[in-house]
């Protein structure tokens, strides 16, 4: 597959919404800001992302929170929880 890293002009995601289901994996990686994703995790569950796309979103969160997700993100994981491994969950500091 072609390696593409720069977000195409006009495709930077201003918010997490259903238009993102039309993004290829590399476009999600390049055009979705991880901090934006973290603050709008509650929206992800309403959008039918493919499992492949969810892998990309999880990767972005993993990069943002290498020591484990904060509770604000964990509470809104929704069906992204299906992508979590036991190792991921062990990092969580849930009270």
């Amino acid at each position: 597959e072609v390696e593409k890293t720069a977000c195409p002009s006009g495709k930077k995601a201003p918010e997490i919404d259903e238009s993102l289901i039309f993004y290829k994996k590399w476009e999600l990686e390049a055009c979705v800001d991880a901090a934006l994703l973290a603050t709008q995790m509650d929206r992800v569950n309403a959008i039918p992302f493919t499992y492949e796309q969810l892998d990309v979103l999880k990767h972005k969160l993993d990069e943002l929170y290498p020591q484990g997700y904060p509770e604000s993100v964990i509470q809104h994981l929704g069906y992204l929880f299906l992508k979590m491994s036991p190792e991921d969950i062990r990092k969580w500091n849930v009270t």
Epitope: E18, N45, A46, I47, P48, F49, T50, Y51, G78, Y79
Partner: nanobody
């Protein structure tokens, strides 16, 4: 067991039309989510058209005005009518079905094996 099967691919000349059909068993498109993805050589898979009661009908920008997605509830099929085809539409086209959970959110996903569409003179 859920099965999703595509049909209708083939070779077509530029400017021509094709109709793809997707039949599902073990899952109904009504109330869930059905879509068509495509994957061109050397590219990643991309959604071209989708429909669901929750989100309505959606199209990718490159196919708007040329492709039409529709569902036949009685036959439990999702069809993709493709008009004004060009070489850039050459790809393997995949049918996709996704379960809509009663509490909201989305459950299991199912893919067809894909059908080749080649646009060439």
């Amino acid at each position: 067991e859920v099965q999703v099967v595509e049909s209708g691919g083939g070779l077509v000349q530029p400017g021509g039309s094709l109709r793809l059909s997707c039949a599902a068993s073990g899952i109904t498109f009504s109330g869930n989510y059905g879509g068509w993805f495509r994957q061109a050589p050397g590219e990643q898979r991309e959604l071209v058209a989708s429909m669901s009661s929750a989100l309505g009908t959606k199209y990718a920008d490159p196919v708007k005005g040329r492709f039409t997605i529709s569902t036949d509830t009685a036959k439990n099929t999702v069809d993709l009518q493709m008009n004004s085809l060009g070489p850039e539409d050459t790809a393997v086209y995949y049918c996709y079905a996704r379960v809509r959970l009663s509490r909201g959110g989305w459950g299991s996903e199912y893919w067809g094996q894909g059908t080749q569409v080649t646009v060439s003179s």
